[in-house]
Amino acid sequence: MAVTACQGLGFVVSLIGIAGIIAATCMDQWSTQDLYNNPVTAVFNYQGLWRSCVRESSGFTECRGYFTLLGLPAMLQAVRALMIVGIVLGAIGLLVSIFALKCIRIGSMEDSAKANMTLTSGIMFIVSGLCAIAGVSVFANMLVTNFWMSTANMYTGMGGMVQTVQTRYTFGAALFVGWVAGGLTLIGGVMMCIACRGLAPEETNYKAVSYHASGHSVAYKPGGFKASTGFGSNTKNKKIYDGGARTEDEVQSYPSKHDYV
């Protein structure tokens, strides 16, 4: 039950995260005009990954797409790539995780297959979240660098009278959406990986046992058990005759469905 809940919650958290990554990627407010020196501008500038916009006091908003590919800064291209990779991986992860959900039955899919799919989707979500966080962080770093560079050259005087104010940009809403969304996708991925451990078929774990002479009676005792990751050796259905021996952690041993009684 706890495994199903963890898996389900991981899926939902990742779904919200990926939706957020998509939203952040599409948003125009990656960078917004810094109003510190001019809080009452009648023209407000903001930029996204795909276009830049100007909102005027009149209520008119004009957006222009970046119609060039080669003319764009390499950093912007890198951020675009990271966000797209994050979305693609996240989308594939979502698709895989739907089939991996314990509450959904598809034919006679074995638990080991579901465990593998859960782990795969979890890893995809983790990488997707990291891509989004990396993309947003690279853009933020680019903004900080440009901000201080433009601050240094903020006013260029012409005879001391005329001032040309350079537009400075600061963090836009999309950055915060991206960071939160990337974090959620990452958390969702981790939850899926945790759920995977509980989903895998249980396997017998053989501990070192100490033998004691106990007459002629031979008792069958179940060994200790370890949750399988789905990649380990399958050593189910092995009988252990321990002649009254006790494993060191027998207190934590429980019979599995594969044990003979």
Partner: antibody
Framework: EVMLVESGGGLVQPGGSLRLSCAAS????????MSWVRQTPGKRLEWVAT????????YYLDSVKGRFTISRDNSKNTLYLQMNSLRAEDTAVYYC?????????????WGQGTSITVSS | DIVMTQSPDSLAVSLGERATINCKSS????????????LAWYQQKPGQPPKLLIY???TRESGVPDRFTGSGFGTDFTLTISSLQAEDVAVYYC?????????FGAGTKLEIK
Amino acid sequence: EVMLVESGGGLVQPGGSLRLSCAASGFTFSTYTMSWVRQTPGKRLEWVATIVGGGGYTYYLDSVKGRFTISRDNSKNTLYLQMNSLRAEDTAVYYCARMGLTQRNALDYWGQGTSITVSS
Amino acid sequence: DIVMTQSPDSLAVSLGERATINCKSSQSLFNSGNQKNYLAWYQQKPGQPPKLLIYGASTRESGVPDRFTGSGFGTDFTLTISSLQAEDVAVYYCQNDHTYPLTFGAGTKLEIK
């Protein structure tokens, strides 16, 4: 046809109050940012205040901040300017003007103006 | 505040001749976001409210005769009337539309010589 008609002007004593109204017609009032601009006896034009379409943002000339309040009633297609603590330097013709949507914040339509004289 | 300085204060031009009015701002009215200049020109005839002629420094308002031309960039702007007509006698104002307060120039009185 776009029409802006101001009213509420007159003679007022220093320290007194007055409320100007501007009735708008011929356009979707709620969509447009509206402004008050005054013209002093020396014929200088001076922007006074601006209010955006939804009424959420207002901007004021420093010398009128705290004394004047711009507001709008979109259901009545009316713009207001509440003027308190009036001074002699507030004497002017007050125009109600519309900020054009695609005119780069320029004022594309103006009313005929209403005159205010602040004198004792 | 952005200070708008108009020159000359008054101008007398013969009918059919070119009239040029200058406007200088203390700060750039150019917006890098959309590569536009936020400056407007108005015409005011006696007893009338101002009328918008030019916005965005160079775009003519609809209905304005093509003899009126706006030009300039950043801090220096010009309004040119290519062939002065009798009805062009008025006071012309430039206005900063970039930053609040939306300041106006002192005006240039245009007369017929």
